[in-house]
Amino acid sequence: KLLQVSTIAMQQQEKLIQQERALLNFTEWKRSCALQMKYCQAFMQNSLSSAHNSSPCPNNWIQNRESCYYVSEIWSIWHTSQENCLKEGSTLLQIESKEEMDFITGSLRKIKGSYDYWVGLSQDGHSGRWLWQDGSSPSPGLLPAERSQSANQVCGYVKSNSLLSSNCSTWKYFICEKYALRSSV
């Protein structure tokens, strides 16, 4: 009788081990499914958002005419600011006209107030000429007011409604600019 009981007990224990194994496999399978589902949903979401997102500018960028602008919330030196903008497929702001300058300064007033923002303007060390990052010269009304007596490289920044100059190694906010997407409709 005792032998019979112990045989049954062993069989039950074996069954229990098998069930535990099955449960473990099931849990693992369920987790794998959930993970795959998550990836699948993320992929679908990205595909859908890029398909529907025909907005001319990315989220948190401001549009004006053919341009999108991003006003940074972090400080960096001029060169790092340029790097950051490039990472977003943009460049530091290049102001082409008084109208654009007015739009930028008006937007800054609404967003943040009177802070310093790097733009894509730098002074050539040899000639002393001011040039935009694409090599073009600023229009006469858009030359920085002389303020920096620095022996180091000098770069341009916007503050309130003025264009000013400073040592490129100082820390400031910055503004990135990219072309707005044209509507394909």
Partner: nanobody, 121 residues
């Protein structure tokens, strides 16, 4: 992942010109900007020129007026032409690609192996 293959370096006479090219393969649809950096002996690596996916360009003060960067989107290739070369242009030139990210300023940088440019008579 993005793989980069550079070509076009070598020995150039002062006053001469050079054309570097860099072909990107892999996840090339995720590229936000392509460009060229250089590193002279004992100096830091510096940006020479870059071009964004939208076609905006950037030049360092050292090549403004002498350099031209262009991009063939169909071939995923970026070209850098520099004229009126000076001995100061001697450096290793590296191709760079910046990729998109869901996080602002969080994109990855990919680098080529570099191509030596020596300006000497």
């Amino acid at each position: 992942q993005v793989q980069l293959v550079e070509s076009g370096g070598g020995l150039v006479q002062p006053g001469g010109s050079l054309r570097l090219s860099c072909a990107a393969s892999g996840s090339s649809d995720s590229i936000n900007a392509m460009g060229w950096y250089r590193q002279a002996p004992g100096k830091e690596r510096e940006l020479v020129a870059a071009i964004t996916s939208g076609g905006r360009v950037v030049y360092s003060d050292s090549v403004k007026g002498r350099g031209t960067i262009s991009r063939d989107n169909a071939k995923n290739t970026v070209y850098l032409q520099i004229a009126s070369l000076k001995p100061e242009d001697t450096a290793v030139y590296y191709c760079n690609v910046k990729t998109k990210s869901a996080v602002l300023f969080g994109g990855m940088d990919y680098w080529g192996k570099g191509t030596q440019v020596t300006v000497s008579s």
